[in-house]
C-alpha cells in the first residue's frame, strides 16, 4: 500500500508522541556521540516537516523516502567529521548505500561514560520541572549505549520509567519506592538489548532464513495449538518487523509491530488461549505482553512424527518439492511437542534432519538410509541436557560469585587473547545463568539456560568482531549460529597461547578499593583473576583458589586498617610476591 508521503503516513499511524520518540531513538542509535540538545533540535525539525506533509502530502520533499529525509538531516550535523571520523564519508553516498554505511558504523561498545544515577530528590525535581525533556533524555541515553535496542520496546521502557517517577516522587519514602523499580528497569533493559542484538545478528550475519527458523521454533513452542499456516504467517510478519528495526527503519518497524499485535488479538482463537490478558492492554504494553506470553498447553494426543517424517513414502518428494516448507513443518511439529528443548537444540535437530535427507534422498534406497534418522538426535539432545545438569550442580555448590569465577577461568583458558574487560563482562553474564535458570523445574531449565547462553555468547561475538584477536572465537562465531554454544563449550586450553608477561601494576591496588560497591569489588577481583590466568594459563584450580583467597584476605585486612593506603602499599607487594611463588 503506497502513500504519496511516507513521512506523513507514519506520523498519522504512530501519532506525534511515538513518532518523536522513535526518531530520537533512530538518531541517537546512529550518532551515538552527539549531545542530547543536538538530537532534540534535529527531531523537532523532522517533526515540524512531517506536520507540513500531513497538512499537504504534495508539499516539497514530502515524497522522499524516510532514509533520504533522515540521512539528509543527520548529514547536516556540523561536527560529523571531527566527532565520527570516517562515518562522515557516508554522507557522500546515495541511498540506500548511505543508510547501509550508517548501519555499519553503529558501535556496540561506544566510548561513553557509565550512567551515574543522581540522588532521588535531584531526579524527582528534574522529572517535575520538565517531564518531557526528562523522558527524552532517558530514550537518548539508552539508545546511544544500545544502538540495536528494539525501538518500540524502548518506548515501553520509557513509559514504565515515567510511571515509576510519577508514582514514587509522590511517595513518603521516595528512594524505597523508586530505586528497586529503576534497578528492575535497568536489568530488564540490558537483557532486552542483548536479546534484540542476537536477533539482529542472526538477520545480518546469517540471513532471514536463519531468523525465520528461529521464529518458527520459538512460536511453535509458544503456540502449539496453532496450525503451521498460522505460525508461518506470524513468522513472516515478525521477520519483517525485526528486519526493519535492525535496519534502522524504526517508524515502519513500530507501525508493523502494532499491526501484528492487532492481528494476533483479532485471531486469538487460532493462535493461543494465553493471549486474552495481553489484548486488553494499551498498545506498548500489549505488544510487550504478547512477546513475553507463556507457552500455551500442548494439544492432547499429538501423533508420533515418525509416520510423516520417516515412514512415509513421500519424504523425499516433499523435500524435493518444497524443501524449506517441509523442513519448516518438521521444525514446527518437533517444537510444539518440545517446550522442554532450547530453540537452539530444536534448530540443530532440524539441521540434522535436513543433512540426512540431503544425503539419503540421493541414495539408492532413501528409506533404508533415513529410517534411523530420529536415533541420530539422541546425542544432540543429551549434550545440552548434561551441560545444564553439570553447570547447575556447580552453581548450587559454589554460589553465583564463585561460579562466575569458575567460568572466568574456563573461558580465559579457552580464549586468552580476548580483552580482559570483555572476558569479565561475558563470564559474569554467563554465570548469571545459574540464578536465572537453575531454580526452574527440569522441563524449563534447558530452554532457559541454552537460549540465554546464546544471547550472552552473541555479545562476545559482537565485541570480538569489532576487534578480532582470536581465530577460535571468529570460527565459533561465524561458522554456525546454532552451534555457537557447543563450539565454545568444546574449546580446550589454548596450547598455542604465549603467556602474558607479569606486570606488577596490574596487581597493584589502592584504598579506593574499600569504597567500591560489592559488585565493583567483585569486578576488580575478577579482573585480577583473568590477568592471573593469562599470566599462568596452566595454573590449577587449587592454585588459583589459593591466590584469590589471599587476595580477598589482603583487601579485607587493608580496608579495616586505620591507614588504608599505607596498608595497600605495604601488603600489596607481599601479596604479589606470594602469588608469584604460589603459581611458580
Amino acid at each position: 500500500d503506497t502513500h504519496k508521503s511516507e513521512v506523513a503516513h507514519r506520523f498519522k499511524d504512530l501519532g506525534e508522541e511515538h513518532f518523536k520518540g522513535l526518531v530520537l531513538v533512530a538518531f541517537s542509535q546512529y550518532l551515538q556521540q552527539c549531545p542530547f540538545e543536538e538530537h532534540v533540535k534535529l527531531v523537532n525539525e523532522v517533526t515540524e516537516f512531517a506536520k507540513t506533509c500531513v497538512a499537504d502530502e504534495s508539499a516539497e520533499n514530502c515524497d522522499k523516502s524516510l532514509h533520504t529525509l533522515f540521512g539528509d538531516k543527520l548529514c547536516t550535523v556540523a561536527t560529523l567529521r571531527e566527532t565520527y571520523g570516517e562515518m562522515a564519508d557516508c554522507c557522500a553516498k546515495q541511498e540506500p548505500e548511505r543508510n547501509e554505511c550508517f548501519l555499519q558504523h553503529k558501535d556496540d561498545n561506544p566510548n561513553l561514560p557509565p550512567l551515574v544515577r543522581p540522588e532521588v530528590d535531584v531526579m524527582c525535581t528534574a522529572f517535575h520541572d520538565n517531564e518531557a525533556t526528562f523522558l527524552k533524555k532517558y530514550l537518548y541515553e539508552v539508545a546511544r549505549r544500545h544502538p540495536y535496542f528494539y525501538a518500540p520496546e524502548l518506548l515501553f521502557f520509557a513509559a514504565r520509567y515515567k510511571a515509576a517517577f510519577a508514582e514514587c516522587c509522590q511517595a513518603a519514602d521516595k528512594a524505597a519506592c523508586l530505586l528497586p523499580k529503576l534497578d528492575e528497569l535497568r536489568d530488564e533493559g540490558k537483557a532486552s538489548s542483548a536479546k534484540q542484538r542476537l536477533k539482529c545478528a542472526s538477520l545480518q550475519k546469517f540471513g532471514d532464513r536463519a531468523f525465520k527458523a528461529w521464529a518458527v521454533a520459538r512460536l511453535s513452542q509458544k503456540f502449539p495449538k496453532a496450525e503451521f499456516a498460522e505460525v508461518s504467517k506470524l513468522v513472516t510478519d515478525l521477520t519483517k518487523v525485526h528486519t526493519e528495526c535492525c535496519h534502522g527503519d524504526l517508524l515502519e518497524c513500530a507501525d508493523d509491530r502494532a499491526d501484528l499485535a492487532k492481528y494476533m488479538c483479532e485471531n486469538q482463537d487460532s493462535i493461543s488461549s494465553k493471549l486474552k490478558e495481553c489484548c486488553d492492554k494499551p498498545l506498548l504494553e500489549k505488544s510487550h505482553c504478547l512477546a513475553e506470553v507463556e507457552n500455551d498447553e500442548m494439544p492432547a494426543d499429538l501423533p508420533s512424527l515418525a509416520a510423516d517424517y520417516v515412514e512415509s513414502k513421500d519424504v523425499c518428494k516433499n523435500y524435493a518439492e518444497a524443501k524449506d516448507v517441509f523442513l519448516g513443518m518438521f521444525l514446527y511439529e518437533y517444537a510444539r511437542r518440545h517446550p522442554d528443548y532450547s530453540v537452539m537444540l530444536l534448530l540443530r535437530l532440524a539441521k540434522a534432519y535436513e543433512a540426512t535427507l540431503e544425503k539419503c534422498c540421493a541414495a539408492a534406497d532413501p528409506h533404508e538410509c533415513y529410517a534411523k534418522v530420529f536415533d541420530e538426535f539422541q546425542p544432540l539432545v543429551e549434550e545440552p541436557q548434561n551441560l545444564v545438569k553439570q553447570n547447575c550442580e556447580l552453581f548450587e555448590q559454589l554460589g553465583e560469585y564463585k561460579f562466575q569465577n569458575a567460568l572466568l577461568v574456563r573461558y580465559t583458558k579457552k580464549v586468552p587473547q580476548v580483552s580482559t574487560p570483555t572476558l569479565v563482562e561475558v563470564s559474569r553474564n554467563l554465570g548469571k545463568v545459574g540464578a536465572k535458570c537453575c531454580k526452574l523445574p527440569e522441563a524449563k531449565r534447558m530452554p532457559c539456560a541454552e537460549d540465554y547462553l546464546s544471547v550472552v555468547l552473541n555479545r562476545l561475538c559482537v565485541l570480538h568482531e569489532k576487534t578480532p584477536v582470536s581465530e577460535k572465537v571468529t570460527k565459533c562465531c561465524t561458522e554456525s549460529l546454532v552451534n555457537r554454544r557447543p563450539c565454545f563449550s568444546a574449546l580446550e586450553l589454548d596450547e598455542a597461547y604465549v603467556p602474558k608477561a607479569f606486570n606488577a601494576e596490574t596487581f597493584t591496588f589502592h584504598a579506593d578499593m574499600c569504597t567500591l560497591s560489592e559488585k565493583e569489588k567483585q569486578v576488580k577481583k575478577q579482573t585480577a583473576l583473568v590477568e592471573l590466568v593469562k599470566h599462568k594459563p596452566k595454573a590449577t584450580k587449587e592454585q588459583l583458589k589459593g591466590v584469590m583467597d589471599n587476595f580477598a584476605a589482603f583487601v579485607e585486612k587493608c580496608c579495616k586498617a586505620d591507614d588504608k593506603e599505607a596498608c595497600f602499599a605495604e601488603e600489596g607487594p607481599k601479596f604479589v610476591a606470594a602469588s608469584q611463588a604460589a603459581l611458580a
Epitope: F228, P303, S312, D314, K317, N318, E321, A322, M329
Partner: nanobody, 123 residues
Framework: QVQLIESGGGLVQAGGSLGLSCAAS????????AAWFRQAPGKEREFVAA???????TYADSVKGRFTISRDNAKSTVALQMNSLKPEDTAVYYC?????????????????WGQGTQVTVSS
C-alpha cells in the same frame, strides 16, 4: 491412519448447486494436501480440485470458475462447493488426502480415500 467420510451428494437439476463435505479423523491433517476426484460410470477416476496446507487451491480446467474447494482445519473438514452444475458432472465424488506440501493432481499420489458420494445432475 486417516479416515475420510464424504457427505452432501444427491440429485440436482442442471444449473443448480450442491455442497460436498469430507470429514477427516484419525490424526491431524491440517498440513496434509486434500483433494476431490470423481468417477463417472465406465470412465477413469479424474482429478477435480486440490488444496494444500496454506489453502492454495488447484482445479481441473473443466470445473474452474464453477467449483470451489476449501478447508476448515478446526473442524478437520474439506468442502467442495459446486455451482452451475452440468449433466457431465454426474459421478461418484471421492475425497482423498496425503501428507504432501505441494498438492498432487494424480490419484496414485494419494494415500487415504473416502468411500465416495453420488452426485447426479439431471437435464
Amino acid at each position: 491412519q486417516v479416515q475420510l467420510i464424504e457427505s452432501g451428494g444427491g440429485l440436482v437439476q442442471a444449473g443448480g448447486s450442491l455442497g460436498l463435505s469430507c470429514a477427516a479423523s484419525g490424526r491431524p491433517v491440517s498440513n496434509y494436501a486434500a483433494a476431490w476426484f470423481r468417477q463417472a460410470p465406465g470412465k477413469e477416476r479424474e482429478f477435480v480440485a486440490a488444496i494444500n496446507w496454506n489453502k492454495t487451491a488447484t482445479y481441473a480446467d473443466s470445473v474452474k470458475g464453477r467449483f470451489t474447494i476449501s478447508r476448515d482445519n478446526a473442524k478437520s473438514t474439506v468442502a467442495l462447493q459446486m455451482n452451475s452444475l452440468k449433466p457431465e458432472d454426474t459421478a461418484v465424488y471421492y475425497c482423498a488426502a496425503v501428507f504432501r506440501v505441494v498438492a498432487p493432481k494424480t490419484q496414485y499420489d494419494y494415500d487415504y480415500w473416502g468411500q465416495g458420494t453420488q452426485v447426479t445432475v439431471s437435464s
